[in-house]
Each structure stands twice: as C-alpha cells, then as structure tokens.
C-alpha cells in the first residue's frame, strides 16, 4: 500500500489508477477506517450521507473534503478500463495535526543552587498523533533522571476533537558555582516523521547561591550546665549571620513563652528549671536553625558535677548529662 500523510481539516484526493477519465466507469472504492466496521463501498453513482467524508469524483478519484482522525485507515480502488483490464490502487492514510507553538508556563524567575527547583511547565496543545516534549539547557538536550534533572509528563486527549495536549514539568538541581543565568527551552517533536520540531521561547532564571550558614553556638555559664540550688545559669546563643536573626528558646523540645533574645538567664535555679535547653535562630531568608542541646542540672552538695554539657546535633532528644 502507498503511504499517504494528510493534515487534519485539509482536503485529500486519492487517484483510482486505471479508471477511465470520465463516466461511464466501472470502479468501486472500499474503505476501512475509524468510521467503518470492516469495509464500506463507495461507487461513482453513490452520493449520500458519506459525501461529507468521502465521495467519488467524475474522474474516479476519491475526494475527502476535510480529513479527520477517523479517516485514518485503508482505501482501495478497483477499476476496469474500456478493454476490461483491472487495476487496483491501495492507500494507507495517516493523519496529523501540528499544534500551536509550545509555551513554558509557571516559569521560575529564580532557582536555588544545591536544591531541587521547578523550572516551569511546557505545554503543547492540539497535536495528532501525540508527539513528545523535550527540554534543553543552553541548547543541549536535558536527560531526565540524570544530574538532578526530573520531568513529570501528562498527556490529555480532547473528548471531541481527539487532539492531544501535552504537559511536561521540569525540575532541576543547579550545581553550586554553576552558570548564574542558564537558558532553558522546550521543544515539541511531532509523532509523524518529516516535520520539524517546534521550540518555545527560552527562559533565563537567575541561580541564587545560598551562603553556607555557620552553626548556631550555644554557650553555657557555668560550663557544663551543672549548678547548685539557687545559683544562676546564663545561656548565650551566638549567631555569626548578618543581619542578626531572631532568637527563641526551647526547653525539653517546647518553645518557652519569652520575647526573642540572644541571652537566657535562669536565676535562682530550682528543680523546675532542670531540663534540656536549645536556641532557635530564625533568618528571613533561610528559615529556622537550631543549636545543639545542653542539659541544665542541679548539683546536690557533695556531688561532683560533669565537666561539659551534653552535645546534641541540631535538635532535641539528645543525651542529657546529669
């Protein structure tokens, strides 16, 4: 069969080889498409409800006024010339529709290095067959699941037209010290060959490099956090960051109802003050950062106190030194 590719909505003429150029003609067209079950026969003297889809022209050719998705299939003509010689024509028709230019929507203006970021969503509407979307960085193809690149794809089909809408969401993790203004673009590749790709306008988000945070230091006075009853403990939260963040205090994992302050003084220590303390520094750009946790305990007369406070990671629930 001869392969024919036709654009949806456009007319198509299929020649019936060997047919006399004008009536009387002995020929018939048979079609097996999305509009038929098995074969539908169309003859020159036809004319009827099928004319909106396909009709035989006076010269024996089959005319499709506006090709649709349902017209994909096999078209055969069997003709007999004036001498009684039979000729067969056989066509395999496939249809296509080129979508509008793809677009990147919900695009990010800024990406953060070292963490996953959504770059944007590429959308292509009105294709047939579906085709594919692919992403490019600085003109080179981006390969999903490589080097911090991930892509989420979705394909939807319009219930009436049968045309496809494709969506592709790009997530990347920019490398620290990489290109500060990378160029991303997306392209649609048609499902049928011999049609060039359609590319979006590029986007150029800025890559922001977060300054590595120095640890929040919690200093205890007296050292080790062990104090006699009625004594005073001073906790100081030291944060090198500028501007100075807000400091809040935690005891046994629960925020203390105190105004923000880098210093916490516990005067006249009693049993109720014993516990694990930490401070939380809240930066406008980085979010909260917690210090190590220290344990404050009361030394009964005659006991020897430890020489250092307990050291936890960032967070509570660490070993207490009591």
């Amino acid at each position: 069969a001869q392969n024919i590719t036709a654009r949806i909505g456009e007319p198509l003429v299929l020649k019936c080889k060997g047919a006399p150029k004008k009536p009387p003609q002995r020929l018939e067209w048979k079609l097996n498409t999305g509009r038929t079950e098995a074969w539908k026969v169309l003859s020159p003297q036809g004319g009827g409800p099928w004319d909106s889809v396909a009709r035989v022209l006076p010269n024996g050719s089959l005319f499709l006024p506006a090709v649709g998705i349902q017209d994909e299939g096999i078209f055969r003509c069997q003709a007999m010339n004036r001498n009684g010689k039979e000729t067969k024509s056989n066509y395999r028709v496939r249809v296509y529709q080129i979508p509008g230019k793809p677009e990147i929507v919900d695009s990010a203006s800024e990406l953060t290095a070292g963490v996953p970021n959504k770059v944007g969503t590429c959308v292509s509407e009105g294709s047939y067959p579906a085709g594919t979307l692919s992403w490019h960085l600085d003109g080179k193809p981006l390969v999903p699941n490589e080097k911090g690149v991930s892509v989420k794809e979705q394909t939807r089909r319009h219930p009436e037209t049968g045309l496809f809408t494709l969506q592709s969401e790009l997530m990347v993790t920019p490398a620290r010290g990489g290109d500060p203004r990378p160029t991303f673009s997306c392209s649609f590749s048609p499902g049928l060959p011999r049609h060039r790709a359609l590319r979006t306008a590029p986007i150029q988000p800025r890559v922001w490099e977060p300054v590595p945070l120095e640890e929040v230091q919690l200093v205890v006075e007296p050292e080790g956090g062990a104090v006699a009853p009625g004594g005073t403990v001073t906790l100081t939260c030291e944060v090198p960051a500028q501007p100075s963040p807000q400091i809040h205090w935690m005891k046994d994992g629960v925020p203390l109802p105190l105004p923000p302050s880098p210093v916490l003084i516990l005067p006249e220590i009693g049993p109720q003050d014993q516990g694990t303390y930490s401070c939380v520094a809240t930066h406008s750009s980085h979010g909260p950062q917690e210090s190590r946790a220290v344990s404050i305990s009361i030394i009964e007369p005659g006991e020897e106190g430890p020489t250092a406070g307990s050291v936890g990671g960032s967070g509570l629930g660490t070993l207490a030194l009591a």
Partner: antibody, heavy 119, light 107 residues
Amino acid sequence: EVQLVESGGGLVQPGGSLRLSCAASGFTFNNYWMTWVRQAPGKGLEWVASIDNSGDNTYYPDSVKDRFTISRDNAKNSLYLQMNSLRAEDTAVYYCARGGDIKVSLDRWGQGTLVTVSS
Amino acid sequence: DIQMTQSPSSLSASVGDRVTITCRASQDVGIYVNWFQQKPGKAPRRLIYRATNLADGVPSRFSGSRSGTDFTLTISSLQPEDFATYYCLEFDEHPLTFGGGTKVEIK
C-alpha cells in the same frame, strides 16, 4: 442554545406552491448539513431533503424529486424548502433538523410547521 | 433502498418494566442508526446516535445495541415520562429511512 424555528406553512391547493423557512441560531450554521423531515397526520417520519454545509450538493427521495428544492443562505443562517406541484399526500408537519450526513444526523429539531394541501 | 423493519408496532407496559424495541436493516448499515422519541404534538428527540451512544441529556436507563443488521433500543426501567412513540433511523445511505415506529402505552 441551539434553536431551529420553521415558518411558512399553511393551506394550499393541489398543484400549488409553498416556501418553508427555517431560522437557525446557537451554532455555526455553515458547519452542518441540514435536513427536512415530514410527518403526515397519524403517520411516521419521512425524510424529505438534505443539503451539504456549502449548499453545493442536495439530496432527495424519489417521492419529492423534481418537485421540491432545498436551499440555504449561510449568511442569514437560514434553510429553505421550495415545494411545487403540491399533492394531497404532501400534507404533513414539516420539521427542519440539523445534520443529515454520517457525522451528525438529526441531533436537533425545530418545532415543525403544518402544510395542508386541499381544495 | 434500505428498509428498516421496526417491531413491535405497539406495546403496553407498566412503570418499572424493561422494554425492548428492535429495528432490522435490510442490508448492512454499519453503526449508522439513531433512535428517536416523539411525544404527541412535539418534535422528535434524539436518544441514541450511531447505534450505541447516549445523546446529551438523555437518562441512562436508555441504551442502544447492535448485532449485525439488528439494532435494539432498551429502556431498563420504564418511567411515566417514557410513554411515547419511538423511531429508528438509518443514515448510512440515501434515502434516509425511518422505522415505522413503536408506540409505548400504559398497561
């Protein structure tokens, strides 16, 4: 909302003529074939004529061929049926309907207009 | 010309009954059959298109099926508003041909 409104029916003598109209609204008229169907009193439905969306091709059953002419004016969103040489057996309610090809077949109908052929 | 033989021409049924109406085409018409409902003094209303598809706004108790050249309209549970006349239509070839109609009456 799709609407089809027929007009032009009435009493006519045998051998006389009548022109029916159908005003269409609520859809893109020139995208659709259009069809006339009739129903004699107490009887079933009978196809009368169809026309393609451009108006270039018309279709009739033998019972009305050469007497009836279907036409359309896409600029006015209107369908017409010119009936000549009317007979008593043409007495019926005439309906205009959208479609008539294999893509869309009679999915919306007008309310009908009565044609009476009698002396 | 294609003939559409519709049966029965009339039937009596009660609310809640399952009702089946059949049309037989005299030759292959593919899937190109519609079903219509008509009430006295009103225009026909399309119920089923292309043999098996339910038209917009039509209750799901109506369904259409096809076996070769036999086409069936089924009302799974007859409702008071379903008492009417039903017609099939073949639209694969001209002349377009309607079945003779089936009048569904209250028993």
